[in-house]
Amino acid sequence: NSLFNQEVQIPLTESYCGPCPKNWICYKNNCYQFFNESKNWYESQASCMSQNASLLKVYSKEDQDLLKLVKSYHWMGLVHIPTNGSWQWEDGSILSPNLLTIIEMQKGDCALYASSFKGYIENCSIPNTYICMQRTV
Amino acid sequence: NSLFNQEVQIPLTESYCGPCPKNWICYKNNCYQFFNESKNWYESQASCMSQNASLLKVYSKEDQDLLKLVKSYHWMGLVHIPTNGSWQWEDGSILSPNLLTIIEMQKGDCALYASSFKGYIENCSIPNTYICMQRTV
């Protein structure tokens, strides 16, 4: 049990969120971090993976309503599969209909997250800021 | 000890955040919630108080760097004191210099928070969305 060093008691009226990597945002037991150094999609993915996380996956407007208010454009973990025309997440799951409005503004196979659940298609090799996410169990 | 019902063990590599009201955002042990119903400043203040919180107080660009990415305009707990011309928070503390760029766009004694640590002066009776904050001990 050497990995554990704290025991905390949680009041019924409030709750703890996490666990998350230190100084990440915790919301509805998901962990998020916004990285403001610009990287291409592949580098962004690698950065998230190195922190035991993945690029942002949008799976619920309710559970992830904090994303409505996010300013600017950030890489998320959505990629286009040319062989079948679908958009899928890093974990292989297909983008659910009506979860994101996909904006066809650039020619590319990756997508940037923008406020109010929009996804902007972008060339995967263009540097952008990115959002990492870690789902707690 | 009847208020407490959970015992959790926290790994050294990760940490829990909070405690916060259920479904609030937790970041660097502060709790935040964005409310999208529009209220005037006084109603917004009352709403936060009813949830054992206060309107947003900006006290640190480092500890509150998540606020950089907030889209739109939201009431925060900053009010103008006409007698001495200062801006102060609900708790009576004075706004620290260089923490917010105050933008004099409207005539008023209250302030809206906008991304990248900007404060927009606004008439306190105008309805706006608002941010509540609860500092954990």
Epitope: P82, M105, K118 | -
Partner: antibody, heavy 121, light 107 residues
Amino acid sequence: QQLEQSGGGLVKPGGSLELCCIASGFDFSTYWMTWVRQAPGKGLEWIGCIHGGGSGTTSYASWVNGRFTLSRDIDQSTGCLQLTSLTAADTAMYYCARPGYRSWSKTFDLWGQGTMVTVSS
Amino acid sequence: DIQMTQSPSSLSASVGDRVTITCQANQDISNALNWYQQKPGKAPKLLIYAASSLQSGVPSRFSGSGSGTDFTLTISSLQPEDFAAYYCQQAASFPLTFGGGTKVEIK
């Protein structure tokens, strides 16, 4: 890059017709193909789309109601639109179109020349 | 389905005029809006995509603006070859829908 349309013509009410669109100059299997129609003197109306790849995923306008069917032949780089149970209201110019990039499905920069379908007894 | 309302349905203008066509969606479509030009007997031609991006090869006198529900196509100085029909199309979600069209005629 080109879309060449074939088919069309005069058909009796209740009849059927197949319109096809041959793609050249690009990898058909990685693009969506869309069909749009335009009744004489009227506006544009989206019919549906099909992906040229292995899955052949389709999407249709709600008014189509199963009367029209999209298909594709990857080897021939061809997309087809089968029209059935035709009525006079289906009289229109039918266009095939391709999006501006393979990951796009809703913005069309390449169009066929159009083929006229006339439904009349 | 998202409904697109275009106005006016027709307009008369002279060469050199500034022409504005509007398109309204019945729900927020962000900037997922395209504009097409169509000349008689021809297929439509993409002018503007993503509300304000000019398609390659389209003259700069064409511009698009707007976001959410209200959009505008502007021709800054009408040329003889611009007399045609113009259509907006929402590209936010299936089923795709077009506006009713605006016919630009010579005054």
